[in-house]
């Protein structure tokens, strides 16, 4: 008597994540008599996927009709495939008897899953930086088999070549996580610049996957500062301008001082965008020189997103000739903290 | 190839718990049962128990009260925790993979860690 | 429980010469599918054991052809056709055919 055969003949079947996966068992001989089982893995901790005879098993449904005389066809059509379902899948040949006692295993085919990547989450830093410094971001996506997956960075449509990238778990498994920090330097003009990070794999069919940041979140751009006297008026007060310039972002906010004393505090608000992303802002005051003996000491002093306050003073001359006061006369630059008062805007 | 590394305190005080993780590298936890088994100093080994990649776990009956044996895929990590502890608890801890092809039965444990040592003592 | 019991406790060898350890179980470890499930392991001084035989007579990966396994149902022996200096340690068998998994006590194997 020829000995039972259980043949398996795919050793393993991939299926993308939804689909049907079609695992083929068929026999050798109609004898010995009993039933044919199927389960996932082996051991005490297999899992019965789906039993000929009895049971109720919904995503399971046998190739040909089971209950056909001399039927030796045992394949099973398993519905809406997930990544859980991956495994070995063993069909098992019982001889009947109280209980059935197993007999015979096929060599198992192992099914794989293919899964699309999560769309890409990109996280920038969590604090600003200014140009020159180098900032890193992250891109992760998860949930993906097979592991093979190219991920590249884009910053402004050009290719980043500074990153370092891991695929998690590094053996095989389920499904995988991609996670890639890119390292990026930052410039005055990257206020409206973007990195891009693409993920390709082959369940996506060739249309890569994209997960965005803006650099305007991980920069900071510092103003310029200038203080200039306009002509003196007929009412013997000087207009001193303070122009702040090429910051972002918007929070800002300025003191003016005379001789050390907080004269007046202003925040900014609602100003219009320069091109490049980053603002202007022109703050005035004017002095009464003829309610002064000595020279004043105007200070302009700016606090940018909470960074310490950048100072520029100057000087307006009372004592001598005082209707002479040039115009547009260079301010000092001191880097002297005052204290800072909030105000409004100006 | 597949590697395997226990880690956890090496010193458990008496009636405290026991709590030990073994991280996979190189392999997947997938088809495999993953094992714990000890061996008090100068004595033979003693199976406490595993856990399937599908999360069903099966341990020793002398230990089964005390056990608790879990798996976390995504960190390719199971862990050991064991209750009540005493003296009589002291040992190398290993854990192991286990291989299952054919039926119900299991077919070697395969890949062992190198062991920890765990002394339980005030 | 399975319990598994090994003898000799202890075996003194010589290089180049066969050693045998003989490992009994209470019930069969012979399933249905003809597969006996009966493992052998070696514990060489100050390391974690390592598969020799699995299922009674099948060698694992990377082990020396001098090592052989038979047996079925609740007999079981070890050969080492000649024995080497390396194979020095403790020598376990264990059951697999069912949980809890049982070990043997052990064989010591150490040159005379």
């Known amino acids: 008597e020829e000995e039972l055969q259980v043949i398996q003949p795919e050793k393993s079947v991939s299926v993308a994540a939804g689909d049907s996966a079609t695992l083929n068992c068929t026999v050798s001989s109609l004898i010995p008599v009993g039933p044919i089982q199927w389960f996932r893995g082996a051991g005490p901790g297999r899992e019965l996927i789906y039993n000929l005879k009895e049971g109720h098993f919904p995503r399971v449904t046998p190739v040909s009709d089971p209950t056909k005389r001399n039927n030796m066809d045992f394949s099973i059509r398993i519905s809406n495939i997930t990544p859980a379902d991956a495994g070995t899948y063993y069909c098992v040949k019982f001889r009947k008897g109280s209980p059935d006692v197993e007999l015979k295993s096929g060599a198992g085919t192992e099914l794989s899953v293919r899964a699309k990547p999560s769309a890409p989450v990109v996280s920038g830093p969590a604090v600003r930086a200014t140009a020159e410094h180098t900032v890193s971001f992250t891109c992760e996506s998860h949930g993906f088999s097979p592991r093979d997956i190219t991920l590249k960075w884009f910053k402004n449509g050009n290719e980043l070549s500074d990153f370092q990238t891991n695929v998690d778990p590094a053996g095989k498994s389920v499904s995988y996580s991609i996670r890639s920090t890119a390292r990026v330097v930052l410039t005055r003009r990257d206020v409206h610049s973007q990195v891009i990070c693409e993920v390709a794999h082959v369940t996506l069919q060739g249309d890569p996957l994209r997960g965005t940041a803006n650099l305007s979140e991980a920069i900071r751009v510092p103003p310029f500062l200038e203080v200039t006297q306009q002509s003196m008026r007929a009412d013997n007060q000087v207009n001193v301008t303070c122009q702040v310039t090429k910051f972002y972002p918007q929070r800002l906010q300025l003191t003016w001082l005379e001789n050390g004393n907080v004269s007046r505090t202003e925040m900014a608000s609602a100003l219009p965008e320069n091109k490049d992303g980053t603002y202007n802002w022109t703050s005035w005051l004017l002095v009464n020189v003829s309610a002064h003996r000595d020279d004043v000491k105007l200070t302009c002093q700016v606090e940018h997103d909470g960074q310490p306050a950048v100072n520029k003073s100057f000087s307006v001359k009372v004592s001598a000739h005082p209707k002479e006061q040039g115009s547009n006369t260079a301010a000092e630059n001191t880097g002297t903290n005052e204290r800072n008062i909030y105000g409004g805007s100006g | 190839q597949v590697q395997l590394q226990e880690s956890g305190p090496g010193l458990v005080r008496p009636s405290e718990t026991l709590s030990l993780t073994c991280t996979v590298s190189g392999g997947s936890i997938r088809n495999y049962y993953w094992s714990w088994i000890r061996q008090p100093p100068g004595k033979g080994l003693e199976w406490m128990g595993f856990?399937?990649?599908?999360?069903?776990?099966f341990y020793n009956p002398s230990l089964k009260s005390r056990v608790t044996i879990s798996l976390d895929m995504s960190m390719n990590q199971f862990s050991l925790k064991m209750t009540s502890v005493t003296a009589a608890d002291t040992a190398v801890y290993y854990c192991?993979?286990?291989?299952?092809?054919?039926?119900?039965?299991?077919?070697?444990?395969?890949?062992w860690g190198q062991g920890t040592t765990v002394t339980v003592s005030s | 429980d399975i319990v598994m019991t090994q003898s000799p406790l202890s075996l003194p060898v010589t290089p180049g010469e066969p050693a045998s350890i003989s490992c009994k179980s209470s019930?069969?470890?012979?399933?249905?599918?003809?597969?006996?499930?009966l493992d052998w392991y070696l514990q060489r001084p100050g390391q974690s054991p390592q598969l020799l035989i699995y299922?009674?007579?099948n060698r694992a990966s990377g082990v020396p052809d001098r090592f052989s396994g038979s047996g079925s149902g609740t007999d079981f022996t070890l050969k080492i056709s000649r024995v080497e200096a390396e194979d020095v340690g403790v020598f376990y068998c264990m059951q697999a055919l069912q949980t809890p998994l049982t070990f043997g006590g052990g064989t010591k194997v150490e040159i005379k």
């Open positions: 856990i399937y990649d599908n999360g069903r776990t």
């Open positions: 299922q009674g007579s």
């Open positions: 019930q069969s470890l012979l399933y249905s599918n003809g597969y006996a499930y």
């Open positions: 192991a993979r286990v291989r299952a092809y054919s039926g119900i039965g299991l077919d070697g444990t395969d890949v």
